[in-house]
């Protein structure tokens, strides 16, 4: 079982300020695919058989100047803005979603436009029926323009 | 088929300002190797059999202060400098090179010397004869001093 | 053979200023595991059989303002602080530890609190008995609070 999913334009979904938002993905077009019973449905990659999987994702973020880049604040800096990616596992056997991987970075840019990727990848023991999703701190900062910049995948080792 | 290639000192090649430059690689010395008919030739990794490959690269960049770090510009920030890595596929069946993976980051540093890596990795369906290369936005910013800082590899899953 | 190790609180160990410090890891609890004779002992992952392994690690660093972020220094910037991760191989057959992977980044933040990950991953030919460890430039900057932020793993390809 294996899959490589690529970003698509996101439909804005209202969510609480500090709550992470789940991304939805392209699974059939361009370089995206699912194979050998790996299934993508409703923002989740669904694991078809138990085993050890390598899971990876890159999210490219872009935005305009973060507040802490304001020169007037340099003498009394504030907690910086940040960008966060979490790969989350939801299991039928366990009610609470589990954070498998987290990439988080403070963003304090003095330039007018900034952009940067967060990359994650590691191996996990997964059970048949486990569901994986990618959550981000701010969906509006995700670069959805190119399939090679923002993606999510997994394969059985 | 598998390969791990490491950086070597690059021969400066003139290229257009906004055109990405292809890196050439060490394929035999130190930790570099190619195996099971994976072949390296003229900046390209050549895929010997069709299948799903995990492809990865890290490029470490280093430079001196970018313009936007100039204190006089803080009040009127300009478009920042950036660093970009692209892993590109060239296929006989398709004339246009395809960008498989892109890592791009704005660079706006106020320190005199900066350095940072961009890491990429993902799984792709490749055909026999496909050729892979790594392109960068500015070859002169690539840290070629150590094989553990800048590298490129692939293996059949 | 495969392993995914996760961070735990580190015991401070005195070490020389420019010497890298080895991290110790969780190998049994939470999402951490070792499998198929891969063994973790005394900060080292011990390779049980020769072959090509994919090795990866993410270290999340966090700290307070680095010196070069001080506004008074902007006109005469100093060499910035930096964060470094090295995955090191120790082999019985070779007395000198070998740096397999290095991720290094200058840190020059004007915000009061900064945090960011360094991710590494690549394939290496290893011999039975080779030992792998992860070293960092400053153990006190490593975020040990969550197993999904700082981890180390390897699997036979």
């Amino acid at each position: 079982p294996k899959a490589h999913l690529t970003i698509m334009r996101q439909t804005p979904v209202p969510h609480l300020k500090n709550e992470l938002a789940a991304l939805h993905w392209e699974n059939n077009l361009g370089m995206a695919f699912t194979k050998n019973r790996m299934n993508y449905t409703n923002k989740f990659l669904v694991i078809p058989e138990s085993g050890d999987y390598f899971i990876y994702s890159q999210i490219t973020f872009r935005g305009t100047t973060s507040e802490c880049g304001d020169i007037s604040r340099v003498r009394r800096p504030k907690k910086p803005d940040s960008i966060t990616v979490v790969i989350t596992k939801v299991a039928d056997s366990y009610p609470e979603p589990a954070h498998l991987l987290t990439g988080t970075k403070s963003v304090c840019e003095i330039s007018s436009n900034w952009f940067q990727p967060i990359y994650l990848g590691a191996m996990f023991s997964l059970e048949e029926g486990d569901r994986l999703m990618v959550n981000v701190s701010d969906i509006s900062l995700v670069d959805y323009t190119k399939e090679d910049k923002t993606f999510f995948g997994a394969f059985l080792i | 088929p598998k390969a791990h290639l490491t950086i070597m000192r690059q021969t400066p090649v003139p290229h257009l300002k906004n055109e990405l430059a292809a890196l050439h690689w060490e394929n035999n010395l130190g930790m570099a190797f190619t195996k099971n008919r994976m072949n390296y030739t003229n900046k390209f990794l050549v895929i010997p059999e069709s299948g799903d490959y995990f492809i990865y690269s890290q490029i470490t960049f280093r430079g001196t202060t970018s313009e936007c770090g100039d204190i006089s510009r803080v009040r009127r920030p300009k478009k920042p400098d950036s660093i970009t890595v692209v892993i590109t596929k060239v296929a006989d069946s398709y004339p246009e090179p395809a960008h498989l993976l892109t890592g791009t980051k704005s660079v706006c540093e106020i320190s005199s010397n900066w350095f940072q890596p961009i890491y990429l990795g993902a799984m792709f369906s490749l055909e026999e004869g496909d050729r892979l290369m790594v392109n960068v936005s500015d070859i002169s910013l690539v840290d070629y001093t150590k094989e553990d800082k800048t590298f490129f590899g692939a293996f059949l899953i | 053979p495969k392993a995914h190790l996760t961070i735990m609180r580190q015991t401070p160990v005195p070490h020389l200023k420019n010497e890298l410090a080895a991290l110790h890891w969780e190998n049994n609890l939470g999402m951490a595991f070792t499998k198929n004779r891969m063994n973790y002992t005394n900060k080292f992952l011990v390779i049980p059989e020769s072959g090509d392994y994919f090795i990866y690690s993410q270290i999340t660093f966090r700290g307070t303002t680095s010196e070069c972020g001080d506004i008074s220094r902007v006109r005469r910037p100093k060499k910035p602080d930096s964060i470094t991760v090295v995955i090191t191989k120790v082999a019985d057959s070779y007395p000198e530890p070998a740096h397999l992977l290095t991720g290094t980044k200058s840190v020059c933040e004007i915000s009061s609190n900064w945090f960011q990950p360094i991710y590494l991953g690549a394939m290496f030919s290893l011999e039975e008995g080779d030992r792998l460890m992860v070293n960092v430039s400053d153990i006190s900057l490593v975020d040990y609070t969550k197993e999904d932020k700082t981890f180390f793993g390897a699997f036979l390809i």
Partner: antibody, heavy 119, light 106 residues
């Protein structure tokens, strides 16, 4: 240049099945997703489903699920659409059409295959 | 499924006149395309991703819109533009088409 060449017109009886082929050339067959769209006489266009030639992954319009089967033979760069349990209202021109990414739209269309269902 | 309603169904226009066709979606759409189809021909991609001209399409064609309301404009109609025009959404499966707008030359 890109070409999608479809099989010829078919006349079928109600309850029978039809299999339409679409041979692709001029591009990497496994790199583009193949769609099937139909158009009844004087009617508008109706999307049947798609197949990713590389993975074999499919996505069907629920209206056709269970009756339409999309397959590919990558060795000859050919896609197939089989429609079973035909009814008279399945009489239509059936098009194959390839797309790379959803923001690209369907740039390449076959010439169409007329399937007539009549007793 | 997302229902696309085109308006008008039919338009008879003199050459050089401006033509405006609207496509209204029953829920928000991220990816909208427009196709032109002439009698006994396959559809042809005209406008992709709301406003981008497809390869080889004359600049008199343009597209705009967002959310649920989209527009195809032909700035100065030519005789060869007599055809039926369809909108199609690629936001959620099934990827539906509008009912079509037939443009006839007076």
């Amino acid at each position: 240049q890109v070409q999608l060449v479809q099989s010829g017109a078919e006349v079928k009886k109600p309850g029978a099945s039809v299999k339409v082929s679409c041979k692709a050339s001029g591009y990497s067959f496994t790199g583009y997703t193949m769609n099937w769209v139909r158009q009844a006489p004087g009617q508008n266009l109706e999307w049947i489903g798609l197949i990713n030639p590389y993975s074999g992954g499919t996505n069907y319009n629920q209206k056709f699920k269970g009756r339409a089967t999309l397959t590919v033979d990558t060795s000859i760069s050919t896609a197939y659409m089989e429609l079973s349990r035909l009814r008279s209202d399945d009489t239509a021109v059936y098009y194959c059409a390839s797309i790379y990414q959803r923001h690209d739209g369907i740039a390449y269309w076959g010439q169409g295959t007329l399937v007539t269902v009549s007793s | 499924e997302i229902v696309l309603t085109q308006s008008p169904d039919f338009q008879s226009v003199t050459p050089k006149e401006k033509v405006t066709i609207t496509c209204s979606a029953s829920s928000s759409v991220n990816y909208m395309h427009w196709y032109q189809q002439k009698p006994d021909q396959s559809p042809k991609l005209l406008i992709k991703d709301t406003s981008k001209l497809a390869s080889g399409v004359p600049s008199r064609f343009s597209g705009s819109g967002s959310g649920t309301d989209f527009t195809l404009t032909i700035n100065s109609l030519e005789a060869e533009d007599a055809a039926t025009y369809y909108c199609q959404q690629w936001s959620s499966s099934p990827y539906t088409f509008g009912g079509g707008t037939k443009v006839e030359i007076k």
